[in-house]
Interface confidence: medium
């Protein structure tokens, strides 16, 4: 009789699991929302308004390219590739906006562009490509533009605060402004290896008259024209056997 | 009351599923056995005895290499790689033994080696590597061996029945026999493109005295020394989105 | 191919894949830049023994060791990832792959 | 890492992964050349709401559409393949990968 009683208790336990309430569509969606946050390692949904997105979202080729991969009105955006069979999202591209840096501010009393903050999770040897994108304002007449990217360093004895990263010369014609990308992979890898060496950069893009065409702090009507870093990484999650 | 009755019927259906008998370990193993056969696209377990395996299993480097990838006494042989997330097994290497062919038998009344039968599932453009492995019997004295692989063709006007695939010259010293591999990728791809052209091959390995050292039909004590084809394929299952 | 596909009008009682669209705009997740919606799908239905059974590793449970397992379950047997472009709340836009977000196939296990 | 690991002596009642070795030699499958045995593992145990829940795509089922779904199930949430060397009964030895043969992790879905 005792074993029969035990069996009934077991059956009841199973049936409790079975008759567990069939949730509504909204509960199902809620569960998927929780799951997405968990997979992206986010505790809560980022608190960002549509206006903030409009200001921040770069109006630049790499973003256009990524967004154009989606037919966002189409219901099925799954790429049908193999199941990675792990839980968390893998990162392929990181687009980083400039943030403020005390060091940069101190240079001559007003904030300068640009300081990029990096997550310690990015490993230097996983960086496949790193490009600094800058927007050059439109010109009135055909002109040659001298673009210079300088890296801020600790002041040297002779007072030097900058060292050159890249210089390039390009011809601009009247019309719309242009996005220009500059390879900064080596610099980024050095920053990741020695984070203390990342004190910021200065961007200059001077035309023949010495006017700076680089948008570093967007003015009115210049939303989405901030400089930004596009970093492509190989993110192969470690698969340890138990 | 009607909806309550419906709910009870539903509950009972769920509970029937729930109280479904917990199977024993042997049932679990049986299910896995069925699953393996299904994944390998086999209707039943191949009926092959230990003796037959000992006779058939080539005693050759590529087999040792494959077997040595396993720690067969260790309980966990999973390679921990990404889940392919599809059902059927993917093939990486096919080792094909020779079979008999009417055409080969007719050449001069006695069976000749070798005819290799291929599955129509192997696509010629998926072949990465194809090697014919032949075993050369030991020699008494140092000698030069002339290895010739001939392809059987439909008799031509001049009576020609063979065309050369590969010839090689190698030096052999007394000791044990050796396994020699010959690249036959192009021939195999042609056979796969035009199966009717696959009439078989002849293997000759003559020493300086004209003795044939190639084991084509193993004699006593020569189990596992048959010629065989080692074919490496890329098997990327098509993944259609629904 | 294994697994049944159904829709909300189906009379199928067995384990089946049903459509379910997740619309990020609808619940105000503007921080997801793309896609704005995607088809997640879900599994539902009854499981008879070995019907559409893909993994026998679950329900064939040692008799002496019941531990409340409720027999075969209608569950995803094939899933695929989606690519997503999103703000991570740290002045960064991330493009990455999220595994197991779309149910491609359902089965009993 | 997600998912619990147990053995036959565990008192754990929740969804857990248990060891199970499949020994091909033991049941006379000599046609499998290697491995001679492998650890398949299996899932068993009770599922409370969202405990170890990996895929919400199963048990969160439309209220108006029950279709006999039995709530969350203890089922494999991560599986891996094994490589196998075997005779296929056609004078051929095949070396290939068989997907989803090892249960690496169990969860409720």
């Amino acid at each position: 009789e005792n074993s029969e009683q035990k069996e009934n208790v077991e059956k009841e336990g199973l049936c409790n699991a079975c008759t567990w309430r069939q949730n509504t569509k909204s509960s199902r969606i809620e569960a998927i929302k929780i799951q997405i946050l968990s997979k992206l390692r986010l505790e809560t949904a980022p608190n960002i308004s549509k206006d903030a997105i409009r200001q921040l979202l770069p109006k630049a080729p790499p973003l256009r390219e990524l967004i154009d991969q989606y037919d966002v009105q189409r219901d099925d955006s799954s790429d049908g590739s193999l199941e990675d069979d792990d839980y968390h999202a893998t990162t392929e591209t990181i687009i980083t906006m400039p943030t403020e840096s005390d060091f940069l501010m101190q240079v001559d009393g007003k904030p300068k562009c640009c300081f990029f903050k990096f997550s310690s999770k990015i490993q230097y040897n996983k960086v496949v490509k790193a490009q600094l994108w800058i927007y050059l304002r439109p010109v009135e007449t055909p002109t040659t533009v001298f673009v210079q990217i300088l890296r801020l360093i600790k002041p040297m004895k002779d007072g030097t605060r900058y060292t050159g990263i890249r210089s390039l010369k390009l011809d601009m014609n009247p019309g719309t402004g242009i996005w220009q990308s500059i390879d900064v992979k080596t610099v980024l890898q050095n920053w990741l290896k020695q984070p203390e060496s990342n004190l910021g950069i200065e961007i200059k893009a001077l035309d023949e008259n010495g006017h700076d065409l680089a948008v570093t702090f967007p003015g009115p009507g210049e939303d989405g024209l901030n400089p930004f870093l596009e970093v492509k990484v190989t993110d192969t999650p470690k698969r340890s056997r138990r | 009351e009607n909806s309550e009755q419906k709910e009870n019927v539903e509950k009972e259906g769920l509970c029937n599923a729930c109280t479904w008998r917990q199977n024993t370990k042997s049932s679990r193993i049986e299910a896995i056995k069925i699953q393996i056969l299904s994944k390998l696209r086999l209707e039943t377990a191949p009926n092959i005895s230990k003796d037959a395996i000992r006779q058939l299993l080539p005693k050759a480097p590529p087999l040792r290499e494959l077997i040595d990838q396993y720690d067969v006494q260790r309980d966990d042989s999973s390679d921990g790689s990404l889940e392919d997330d599809d059902y059927h097994a993917t093939t990486e290497t096919i080792i094909t033994m020779p079979t008999e062919s009417d055409f080969l038998m007719q050449v001069d009344g006695k069976p000749k080696c070798c005819f290799f039968k291929f599955s129509s599932k192997i696509q010629y453009n998926k072949v990465v590597k194809a090697q014919l492995w032949i075993y050369l019997r030991p020699v008494e004295t140092p000698t030069t061996v002339f290895v010739q692989i001939l392809r059987l063709i439909k008799p031509m006007k001049d009576g020609t029945r063979y065309t050369g695939i590969r010839s090689l010259k190698l030096d052999m010293n007394p000791g044990t026999g050796i396994w020699q591999s010959i690249d036959v990728k192009t021939v195999l791809q042609n056979w796969l493109k035009q199966p009717e052209s696959n009439l078989g091959i002849e293997i000759k390995a003559l020493d300086e005295n004209g003795h044939d050292l190639a084991v084509t039909f193993p004699g006593p004590g020569e189990d596992g020394l048959n010629p065989f084809l080692e074919v490496k394929v890329t098997d990327t299952p098509k993944r259609s989105r629904r | 191919d294994f697994g049944l596909d159904c829709d909300e009008h189906s009379t199928e009682s067995r384990c089946c894949r049903y459509p379910l669209t997740v619309d990020f705009e609808a619940f105000g997740w503007d921080w997801i830049i793309a896609p704005k919606r995607y088809k997640a799908n879900y599994c539902s239905g009854e499981c008879e023994f070995v019907f559409l059974q893909k993994y026998p590793h679950t329900h064939l449970v040692h008799q002496a060791n019941p531990r409340g397992s409720a027999g075969p379950c209608c569950t995803p047997t094939k899933m695929s990832p989606i690519n997503m472009l999103y703000f991570n709340g740290k002045e960064q836009i991330i493009y990455g792959k999220i595994p197991a977000m779309v149910v491609d196939r359902c089965g009993c296990s | 890492d997600f998912g619990l690991d147990c053995d036959e002596h565990s008192t754990e009642s929740r969804c857990c992964r248990y060891p199970l070795t499949v020994d091909f030699e033991a049941f006379g499958w000599d046609w499998i050349i290697a491995p001679k045995r492998y650890k398949a593992n299996y899932c068993s145990g009770e599922c409370e709401f969202v405990f170890l829940q990996k895929y919400p795509h199963t048990h969160l089922v439309h209220q108006a559409n029950p279709r006999g779904s039995a709530g969350p199930c203890c089922t494999p949430t991560k599986m891996s393949p094994i490589n196998m060397l075997y005779f296929n009964g056609k004078e051929q030895i095949i070396y290939g990968k068989i997907p989803a043969m090892v249960v690496d992790r169990c969860g409720c879905s």
Partner: antibody
Framework: QVTLKESGPVLVKPTETLTLTCTVS????????ISWVRQAPGKGLEWVGI???????YYASWAKKRLTISKDTSKNQVVLTMTNMDPVDTATYYC?????????????WGQGTLVTVSS | DIVMTQSPATLSLSPGERATLSCTSS????????LSWFQQKPGQPPKLLIY???TLAYGVPSRFSGSGSGTDFTLTISSLQPEDAATYYC??????????FGQGTKVEIK
């Protein structure tokens, strides 16, 4: 004539790295496995590792963290590198054709080279 | 780890006598027959005698024979000759790239 010949330092200091070369003649390394076996003075044979015809390596469990075997087919050479040498690694190191215990592996051996580990 | 045990450690017999050397493996060798026997004389490298547990290597006198399967193997020298004085080793293969030697049996001729 088919031959194998081991060469390398006779004396190695503790913690140093040992590099031994097995030079073969009359053997095609792209078709032949080469094994390394060692024998401490007055002791038995001990399997060290293999490099297979296809270039895959298999090492004895005790050697996995310290051992690398590589080959240069064009030079007819197989190289054994063992790091962090210890006096207990004092032995005669042999290279052999094939794999002892598999088929007729081990039908041909080098003469061996005695390596002494001492400060 | 795999252990291969050879017995006896030393065998002392007269010429013409039958020598029986035993080799036991803690695990079954691969395919039941991945086992070889080697002969080694002082100052020389080993010499292959038997492979696949029972196949006589090229040039080895027929008085040597091998038998056994799985975990238990025997090397028999039907009629000992003075030149057979040596140490004999068994070597097993286990798949997974694992190989092991026995500790050896020393055969002395009285």
């Amino acid at each position: 004539q088919v031959t194998l010949k081991e060469s390398g330092p006779v004396l190695v200091k503790p913690t140093e790295t040992l590099t031994l070369t097995c030079t073969v003649s009359g053997i095609d390394l792209s078709h032949t496995d080469i094994s390394w076996v060692r024998q401490a003075p007055g002791k038995g044979l001990e399997w060290v590792g293999i490099i297979s015809y296809a270039g895959k390596t298999y090492y004895a469990s005790w050697a996995k963290k310290r051992l690398t075997i590589s080959k240069d087919t064009s030079k007819n050479q197989v190289v054994l590198t063992m790091t962090n040498m210890d006096p207990v690694d004092t032995a005669t190191y042999y290279c052999a054709r094939g794999v002892p215990a598999y088929s007729h592996g081990g039908d041909l051996w080098g003469q061996g080279t005695l390596v002494t580990v001492s400060s | 780890d795999i252990v291969m045990t050879q017995s006896p450690a030393t065998l002392s017999l007269s010429p013409g006598e039958r020598a029986t050397l035993s080799c036991t493996s803690s695990q079954s060798v691969y395919h039941a027959n991945w086992l070889s026997w080697f002969q080694q004389k002082p100052g020389q490298p080993p010499k292959l005698l038997i492979y696949w547990a029972s196949t006589l290597a090229y040039g080895v006198p027929s008085r040597f024979s091998g038998s056994g399967s799985g975990t238990d193997f025997t090397l028999t020298i039907s009629s000992l000759q003075p030149e057979d004085a040596a140490t004999y080793y068994c070597a097993g293969g286990y798949g997974g790239g694992r190989y092991a030697f026995g500790q050896g049996t020393k055969v002395e001729i009285k």
